[in-house]
């Protein structure tokens, strides 16, 4: 397993509709054809997997049907979007990138993006 640098923004504020987007960029040392991206959430010293997708370079990311994540890739950048967020989902979202094929296997873990989700004021039809 070889180390790889992964960059992501430090802070993102979710929209009033509970949507947060951020870019996860990795420094690919070679020409990977198969990449796996995992989003982890760290809160209260617990780390849980939010979503994961494997994609072939040049193709769309494919998350599971019931995933709360969507994403697109462009070169060594992955644009990730998480939906359905509310205040209790505030936390540090860590981007983990694995270059699966061809060998050698590379692993990179970002420092995390702190996503803040705010409960809107109680007004008609606001998003919570």
């Amino acid at each position: 397993c070889k180390a790889m640098h992964v960059a992501q923004p430090a802070v993102v504020l979710a929209s009033s509709r509970g949507i947060a987007s951020f870019v996860c960029e990795y420094a690919s040392p070679g020409k990977a054809t198969e990449v796996r991206v995992t989003v982890l959430r760290q809160a209260d010293s617990q780390v849980t997997e939010v979503c994961a997708a494997t994609y072939m370079m040049g193709n769309e990311l494919t998350f599971l049907d019931d995933s709360i994540c969507t994403g697109t890739s462009s070169g060594n950048q992955v644009n990730l979007t998480i939906q359905g967020l509310r205040a209790m989902d505030t936390g540090l979202y860590i981007c983990k990138v694995e270059l699966m094929y061809p060998p050698p296997y590379y692993l990179g873990i970002g420092n995390g993006t702190q996503i803040y989700v705010i409960d809107p004021e109680p007004c008609p039809d606001s998003d919570f």
């Epitope: 509709r17 849980t48 997997e49 709360i68 967020l85 209790m88 989902d89």
Partner: antibody, heavy 123, light 107 residues
């Protein structure tokens, strides 16, 4: 095991107020949102509002704005729903239901409901 | 205001039939939709969340699909205990509106 236990049935006169309680047990109270949903006799489900027990933040359905108040007491793991200026059409069974944050592992929304509290408004 | 419209409002089917209930939403909600079953005199029970995730303990004859504004609940082989009213609901964002319900009866 997870339980949401609601207060007993109430009979109220038009114009009066009612306060229904929902006591949670078997899970971390402040880690889940709580909703209130009502169902008039023979009718469908109607969402009333949501409260975040950890912050006290609330959001109410437009229909109930100004007439409903939802609060939580973390010391007793209880949420309350108060409805004032009662009218006959408020006669219904009132339910509380818990709702985890979307990022909670194996968390499903509205997975546990209280047993329901019948509120009858009659002169 | 967001609206959820279920169809049909009621339906009658035979044991073993494949039954489909649809829920149309007035705006795009991605996949953030629940399905419930409520038997007469009982509290609602969660069947499907996030459009297609089967809730723990729910029989595999229930399945959900759809995204955006059009969603479907399917019962692959109707059982006598499925006599109930079924509701869809928008979740994870207020207002958490319910559909008007679909009453399912056995022929």
């Amino acid at each position: 095991q997870v339980q949401l236990v609601q207060s007993g049935a109430e009979v109220k006169k038009p114009g009066a107020s009612v306060k229904v309680s929902c006591k949670a047990s078997g899970y971390t109270f402040t880690s889940y949102y709580m909703h209130w949903v009502r169902q008039a006799p023979g009718q469908g489900l109607e969402w009333m509002g949501i409260v975040n027990p950890s912050s006290g933040s609330t959001n109410y359905a437009q229909k109930f704005q100004g007439r409903v108040t939802m609060t939580s007491d973390t010391s007793t793991s209880t949420v309350y729903m108060g409805l004032n200026s009662l009218r006959s059409e408020d006669t219904a069974v009132y339910y509380c239901a818990r709702d985890p944050p979307i990022t909670m592992v194996r968390g499903a929304p509205f997975d546990y409901w209280g047993q329901g509290t019948l509120v009858t408004v009659s002169s | 205001d967001i609206q959820l419209t279920q169809s049909p409002s009621s339906l009658s089917a035979s044991v073993g039939d494949r039954v489909t209930i649809t829920c149309r939403v007035s705006q795009d909600i991605s996949r953030l939709l629940n399905w419930y079953r409520q038997k007469p005199g009982e509290i609602p029970k969660l069947l499907i969340y996030r459009a297609s995730s089967l809730q723990s303990g729910v029989p595999s004859r229930f399945s959900g699909s759809g995204s955006g504004t059009d969603f479907t609940l399917t019962i692959s082989s109707l059982q006598p205990e499925d006599i109930a009213t079924y509701y869809c609901q928008r979740t994870y964002s207020a207002p958490y509106t319910f559909g008007q319900g679909t009453k399912l009866e056995i022929k």
